[in-house]
């Protein structure tokens, strides 16, 4: 922490500008009025202060805000964004999309994934849900941040706004925020034709459930291998060979580059080698002919 | 414009391990597996695994027996190769190569990655 | 593991001339699953065919692949200064994926 010094007279300071950077850490502190620097952050950035300069400004206005910025503040960081942490940005409310475009900006090409899911989460917590304006904010400014959101913020997503999102921004998401997702989206689409369903419907289907992958197996809609990689294990075990070779068509043949990837492995460990041989890949590893398979947890079940 | 941009050019000691980096840009991550494949001075190619960077998942040439590891950073776009217990056949230039899922050719290539292994 | 065998290892060609290049399999290679790539000095590889006949883009039409079964051939139809590059192919059909030696073809 910065030592407390009383500040020399002829150092005192009226206002935010240039000749600040001549001054050293202790001098800053003693100073520089943090009323003073938060009505006139908007000077902040434009001065080339030292990283070391920048932590006494942050010391600054955390004493003067312990309970978080205010916005009018946080508007107006620049460069000292970078030297928040996220416990720092949790404390905020924010609610201004040029806000985190300001934001988001600086942050580009700094090491802040954190910082930045942290600050999406508080402009999502202050607007109240994730409206388009945000959703069209987030896809312009910080492709891919939409999967720093949890699944609860996700779920705060009208349908209507699923279709300004792209595929590039689902790249990052999970399974668990592709499950609040999915749902959403086939509600958004559900008015298309086939072709034009797939095409998207496709981000979204790491979180399709069996039955739904099933109905697209009958629409010949030719997923790649890309797509049926995505698919949650638990909604490709069940496929059975032909449901398969009719939901990937053409790209069928691609199951034996990827046979050792999961879930394409585990799949082809549920499936009777007869009906693998059908699809003339040479995939080997399934159930062995004359086999009988008895599910135990059906067994359980009924005990 | 689609680019692999691999790290910089390494000299290691036997026995110590190197981790090389490998950033995607300009296509999306996930619908492309990453490979990696080394060719010793003056020698041909040889496939070292790959990595299935949506789930994860990786395959590995069984002649790297548990000294390969692959990872991914869904975030930064990059993956990276780790191969440890390094020896001098080891030296070597490393690619990591561009395989779309569900084919098994490799249309974009990083400039690659030359590891020196001497004592 | 497949082993691919290249022949031959070297070949120095004159322009305008036709050359091939033989990649035979130890066993069955599924053709959908072969490649060809092209490498010049202190360059990446680059890939030319795949899936043993599909050009791939940007690749001059003078080159050519075929083949099935274990045995495949790259034709240079008529050679150029550019080609000089050691030419490789390369299996995916079983693990591990192997290539083969490598030709290297010089500009007389």
């Known amino acids: 922490d910065v030592e407390r010094t009383t500040c020399p007279p002829e150092k005192e300071v009226h206002e935010i500008d240039e000749s600040l950077i001549f001054y050293k850490k202790r001098e800053l502190e003693a100073c520089v009025d943090a009323a003073l620097l938060a009505a006139q952050m908007d000077r902040v950035d434009a001065i080339p202060f030292t990283y070391e300069q920048l932590d006494v400004l942050k010391h600054k206005l955390d004493e003067l805000y312990p309970q978080g910025y205010p916005e009018s503040v946080i508007r107006h960081l620049g460069h000292l964004f970078l030297k928040m942490s996220p416990e720092d940005i949790r404390k905020w409310n924010v609610t201004s999309l040029e806000t985190l475009k300001a934001l988001l900006k600086v942050s580009k090409g700094h090491e802040m994934s954190a910082q930045v899911a942290t600050l999406i989460d508080r402009v999502v917590v202050g607007r109240g849900q994730l409206d388009k304006d945000t959703v069209d904010t987030l896809t312009a400014f910080c492709p891919g941040c939409l999967c720093s959101l949890s699944p609860e913020r996700l779920s705060s997503v009208p349908p209507s706004v699923i279709g300004a999102v792209r595929p590039q921004d689902l790249d990052t998401c999970g399974p668990r925020q592709l499950d609040v997702l999915y749902p959403k989206a086939r509600l958004a689409f559900q008015n298309m034709s086939g072709s034009e369903y797939f095409v998207k419907i496709r981000p979204f289907l790491g979180g399709a459930p069996t039955e739904d992958v099933k109905a697209l197996s009958q629409q010949n809609v030719s997923m790649d291998l890309a797509t049926f990689m995505k698919l949650r294990r638990e909604a490709v075990l069940p496929l059975t060979v032909a449901e398969v070779q009719k939901l990937l068509g053409p790209h069928v043949e691609g199951l034996k580059v990827e046979e050792q990837h999961s879930p394409v492995r585990d799949w082809i460990l549920k499936q009777r080698q007869d009906d693998l041989d059908t699809l003339g890949l040479g995939l080997q590893g399934g159930i062995p002919n004359g086999y009988l398979i008895l599910d135990l947890s059906v067994r359980e079940a009924l005990s | 414009e689609v680019q692999l941009v691999q790290s910089g050019a390494e000299v290691k000691k036997p026995g110590a391990s190197v981790k090389v980096s490998c950033k995607a840009s300009?296509?999306?991550?996930?619908?492309?597996?990453m490979d990696w494949v080394r060719q010793a001075p003056g020698q041909g190619l040889e496939w070292m695994g790959d990595?299935?960077?949506?789930?994860?998942?990786?395959i590995y040439n069984q002649k790297f027996n548990g000294r390969v590891t692959m990872t991914e950073d869904k975030s930064a776009s990059t993956v990276y190769m780790e191969l440890s217990s390094l020896r001098s056949e080891d030296t070597a230039v490393y690619y990591c190569?561009?395989?779309?899922?569900?084919?098994?050719?490799?249309?974009?290539w990083g400039q690659g990655t030359t590891v020196t292994v001497s004592s | 593991e497949i082993v691919l065998t290249q022949s031959p290892d070297f070949q120095s060609v004159t322009p305008k001339e036709k050359v091939t290049i033989t990649c035979s399999a130890s066993?069955?290679?599924?053709?959908?699953?072969l490649s060809w790539y092209q490498q010049k000095p202190d360059q990446s590889p680059k890939l030319l065919i795949y899936?043993?006949?599909n050009l791939a883009s940007g690749v001059p039409s003078r080159f050519s692949g075929s083949g099935s079964g274990t045995d495949y051939t790259l034709t240079i139809n008529s050679l150029e200064a550019e080609d000089a590059a050691t030419y490789y192919c390369?299996?995916?059909?079983?693990?591990?994926?192997?290539f083969g030696g490598g030709t290297k073809v010089e500009i007389k």
């Open positions: 300009g296509y999306t991550f996930t619908d492309y597996n």
């Open positions: 899936r043993t006949s």
């Open positions: 066993s069955s290679v599924i053709s959908s699953y």
């Open positions: 390369h299996q995916w059909s079983s693990f591990p994926y192997t």
């Open positions: 990595i299935n960077p949506s789930t994860g998942g990786t």
């Open positions: 190569a561009r395989r779309r899922i569900g084919t098994g050719y490799f249309d974009v």
